[in-house]
Amino acid sequence: AQHVTTQLVLRNKGVYESVKYIQQENFWIGPSSIDLIHLGAKFSPCIRKDQQIEQLVLRERDLERDSGCCVQNDHSGCIQTQRKDCSETLATFVKWQDDTGPPMDKSDLGQKRTSGAVCHQDPRTCEEPASSGAHIWPDDITKWPICTEQAKSNRTGFLHMDCQIKGRPCCISTKGSCEITTREYCEFMHGYFHEEATLCSQVHCLDKVCGLLPFLNPEVPDQFYRLWLS
């Protein structure tokens, strides 16, 4: 059986939309599937790599690599999106390409970044971990670390940094899929909102879905002990 909840929820474009949340009900009247997984149920994607989920994550990453920061022209906020999802009239899509990107580093002026920009994250304004020396962030935003400390400056002069961020990664469903969403939407969908991250590639949703002990490698499920837990 399914339990359907409908509610007006603030979405990425800054407007309230009617959203449906469909929850698979437990036939035996008990915990939801997500709770059962957290409690240690035999759920194969937590035990070993699931090809379907792996494909989903790779597809999400490929899309994210081509994303940019969509900044609303009325200064109401910004969100990481695909170009097609960013209004040409009401917003500015900040995406580095050709010669418009910053150099990889002050030591390498010739090599320009083509992957990015990312709303609220920039190698030029992140103090920790700093993009310098042997630790220059790669020209692939899906390989960027989470910035734990921004440079202490109110404004940077960069559109994608000085805007109010409206969405962050949200882990939704037992499949461990990730979307950049508002906190409100994420909570309504019973997802896990990652306040600390800017990109889906920085979070490991399946690790969150599975719970229990974190995977040794966040990309590789290894909870073989589930076979004995349940």
Epitope: D99, T100, G101, P102, P103, K106, S107, L109, G110, K112, R124, T125, E127, A130, S132, G133, A151, K152, R155, T156, G157, F158
Partner: antibody, heavy 123, light 106 residues
């Protein structure tokens, strides 16, 4: 209010080492992203970039002069220094230090300059 | 190294006149930076990233260009604009400046 001021010996003889100091206020060279550059201008000639130093102690030099240049800083005293070894008359110029900014820029720029110090190399 | 060639070397303009000067690079660069220098003074940043006005710079100044060809335009010349204008590149080391365009008041 950002301000920079250069100081130097005024006059020195060929083969000596020129030591320049840039004292600044309104920013700190220990702040992430900050940098200071040295640029000189010979009488009636254009501007010539010499060297940059950054908050993380990264240093970049003009290769044409690299063997003679040494840039350094004392962030606690808000000072940057430039030494030019084995000077000759061609090094006679006005020497400027400038803060490196990048507000809103994909690269960087010299956004605030000192007043300059005139150096004459003469025997 | 990247060589920047400014032209003309010297020019004059009457108040209210439109002024355009150019800076060409011997190889492709990403952005151009422009500085104004008056006699006895230090250079002042006018334009960064080819077309962005630095803080406090009057809107009569504008910059444009791409690749190897860039220009600085003053829409209506004013007496206080008489100065030498230098272009600069930050696309590769060594950082280089143009020799300057001296703008005189007619």
């Amino acid at each position: 209010q950002v301000a920079l001021k250069e100081s130097g010996p005024g006059i020195l003889q060929p083969s000596q080492t020129l030591s320049l100091t840039c004292s600044f206020s309104g920013f700190s060279l220990s702040t992430f992203g900050m940098g200071v550059g040295w640029i000189r201008q010979s009488s009636g000639k254009g501007l010539e970039w010499l060297a940059n130093i950054w908050w993380d102690d990264d240093k970049y030099y003009n290769p044409a002069l690299k063997s003679r240049l040494t840039i350094s800083k004392d962030a606690s005293k808000n000072q940057a220094f430039l030494k030019i070894a084995n000077v000759d008359t061609a090094d006679t110029a006005t020497y400027y230090c400038a803060r490196i900014g990048n507000y809103g820029s994909n690269y960087w720029y010299f956004d605030v300059w000192g007043t300059g110090t005139t150096v004459t190399v003469s025997s | 190294q990247i060589v920047l060639t400014q032209s003309p070397a010297i020019m004059s303009a009457s108040p209210g006149e439109r002024v355009t000067m150019t800076c060409s690079a011997n190889s492709r660069i990403s952005y151009m930076y422009w500085y104004q220098q008056k006699p006895g003074s230090s250079p002042r940043l006018l334009i960064y990233d080819t077309s962005n006005l630095a803080s406090g710079v009057p809107v009569r100044f504008s910059g444009s260009g791409s690749g190897t060809s860039y220009s600085l335009t003053i829409s209506r010349m004013e007496a206080e604009d008489a100065a030498t204008y230098n272009c600069q590149q930050w696309s590769s080391y060594p950082l280089t400046f143009g020799a300057g365009t001296k703008l005189e008041l007619k």
